[in-house]
């Protein structure tokens, strides 16, 4: 809390103005009136001004507006932003997309904050929807922003979207978004060829169905294991062991290692033994010979 | 593609004079608030000067302070810095800077000039 | 406000995580920035605000800190990375930097 003093005389702030840099904390408090700052907020940005005389400046701001700031101030907050804690952001009303851009542009080099999040909520409830051109602002900032939304949220995401995508960034998505963004992606790589295909898809073939799996063991393309053991388990136990160790190439030894996890182990339990054992790896645990498979599932839709 | 290119330094006796130049290329330089840093040989960062977009608003560093002078051209692109008095200890490489807008960090730096002080 | 960097210099090899530190005289806030300095080569900021990457910034280097005790750390140090650098505080006027520290090659 700055103390209140009386403002020297010819000092007096009439505009927001480079004179300002060199004042003191107190002169800042005590010659700057809050309703000017509010109306020439853009011009604080072009000053290059120290995090306590920020500070002094948030302040006057808090006083003038206990509510909540009005966009029209949100929107030139410029560096103040990172001087914001998440219950001041609360307050806001954030509709206009120029806003939320001016003020993630202030934040990009920070991993998504608490300040961030809380300002993303105040968007997306003030706007009522979580638009396309929200999640194309929001993927380009925050890639990894995907993983927090819901499946049903996931649906709008456009296509184009999903090129800044970085792998790290589905770190934390779990199965049902990667069954949603899967088709988004396979939909905006389609025009690659196929290695390059595979490097962008690869951190998406979570969400890939058996067909497409299948499509791609006929292109020598190398999967390694720590994908493959991401892929979803019913779309991997309909591949025969050919298919997988096409998929695998080199790699396929690798399923010794992981022969105890899924979806390794379900595959390998409804593989014939005898297959299994053309691979050379050891695998036990596949349908001895001579043993028929019965897919009851089958009987039972049949019946 | 910004940059910043000093030039200027040389060999000088105590007590002599010699101004740098800083020609600035890449953004808006009227837009922006530019320093001077020094950086004496085997030694740290020191900021020296500092000039405000419009140039009315200047600071010096204590230890150079009566004896340097900072101003800028806008209409040139440039940034000066007239030094006199030489000392000893201003022996050293002079960088020019941008400072961010609206933040007090310097965004640009130049490659530096060397300006060494001796009899 | 006084800045001061430890170590002065270190020896390191590719790969390794090297950690430098930087302790202001008072408390600056989060007001912390980074530079990288190549021999020969202009200073370039990496990180401000303590902990925010500048654009164009490997993943690698983070920073931390908030207060007085401040730490850049490189995670897995690359052939590019042997430099000396330097905080800076912006947290009031007059600016000042640390002493520096150099990460040279074991």
């Known amino acids: 809390e700055v103390e209140k003093t009386a403002c020297p005389s010819g000092k007096k702030a009439r505009e927001i103005d480079e004179s300002l840099i060199f004042y003191k904390k107190w002169e800042l408090e005590a010659c700057v009136d809050a309703a000017l700052l509010a109306t020439q907020m853009d011009r604080v940005n072009a000053i290059p001004f120290t995090y306590e005389q920020l500070d002094v400046l948030k302040h006057k701001l808090d006083e003038l507006y206990p509510q909540g700031y009005p966009e029209s101030v949100i929107q030139h907050l410029g560096y103040l932003f990172l001087k914001m804690s998440p219950e001041d952001i609360r307050k806001w009303n954030v509709t206009s997309l120029e806003t939320l851009k001016a003020l993630l542009e202030v934040n990009k080099g920070h991993e998504m904050s608490p300040q961030v999040a809380t300002l993303i909520d105040r968007f997306v409830k003030g706007r009522g929807q979580l638009d396309k051109d929200t999640l194309d602002t929001l993927t380009a900032f925050y890639p990894g922003y995907l993983c927090s939304l819901s499946p049903e949220e996931l649906s709008s995401v456009p296509p184009s979207s999903i090129w800044a995508v970085r792998p790290q960034d589905l770190d934390t998505c779990d199965p049902r978004q990667l069954d949603v963004l899967y088709p988004k992606a396979r939909l905006a790589f389609q025009n690659m060829n196929g290695s390059e295909y595979f490097v962008k898809i690869q951190s998406f073939l979570g969400g890939a169905p058996t067909e497409d799996l299948k499509a791609l063991s006929q292109q020598n393309v190398s999967m390694d294991l720590a994908t493959f053991m991401k892929l979803r388990t019913d779309a991997v136990l309909p591949l025969t062991v050919a298919e997988v160790q096409k998929l695998l190439g080199p790699h396929v030894e690798g399923l010794k290692a992981e022969e105890r996890h899924r979806p390794v182990r379900d595959w390998i339990l409804r593989q014939r033994q005898d297959d299994l054992d053309t691979l050379g790896l050891g695998l036990q645990g596949g349908i001895p010979n001579g043993y028929l498979v019965l897919d009851l599932s089958m009987q039972e839709a049949l019946s | 593609q910004v940059q910043l290119v000093e030039s200027g330094g040389g060999l000088v006796k105590p007590g002599g004079s010699l101004r740098l130049s800083c020609a600035a290329s890449?953004?808006?330089?009227?837009?922006?608030?530019m320093s001077w840093i020094r950086q004496a040989p085997g030694k740290g960062l020191e900021w020296v000067s500092y000039?405000?977009?419009?140039?009315?608003?200047?600071y010096y560093a204590d230890s150079v302070k009566g004896r340097f002078t900072i101003s800028r051209d806008n209409a040139k692109n440039s940034l000066y810095l007239q030094m006199n008095s030489l000392r000893a200890e201003d022996t050293a490489v002079y960088y020019c800077a941008s400072l961010q807008r609206g933040l007090a960090l310097f965004q640009h730096w130049g490659q530096g000039t060397l300006v060494t002080v001796s009899s | 406000i006084q800045l001061t960097q430890s170590p002065s210099s270190l020896s390191a090899s590719v790969g390794d995580r090297v950690t430098i530190t930087c302790r202001a005289s008072?408390?600056?806030?989060?007001?912390l920035a980074w530079y990288q300095q190549k021999p020969g080569k202009a200073p370039k900021l990496l990180i401000y605000?303590?902990?925010s990457l500048e654009s164009g910034v490997p993943s690698r280097f983070s920073g931390s800190g908030s207060g007085t005790d401040f730490t850049l750390t490189i995670s897995s140090l690359q052939p590019e990375d042997f430099a000396t650098y330097y905080c800076?505080?912006?947290?009031?006027?007059?600016?000042?930097f640390g002493g520096g520290t150099k990460v040279e090659i074991k």
């Open positions: 008072q408390g600056i806030s989060s007001a």
């Open positions: 605000d303590a902990s």
């Open positions: 800076q505080q912006f947290n009031s006027y007059p600016l000042t």
């Open positions: 000039i405000s977009s419009s140039g009315s608003t200047i």
């Open positions: 890449g953004f808006t330089f009227s837009d922006y608030y």
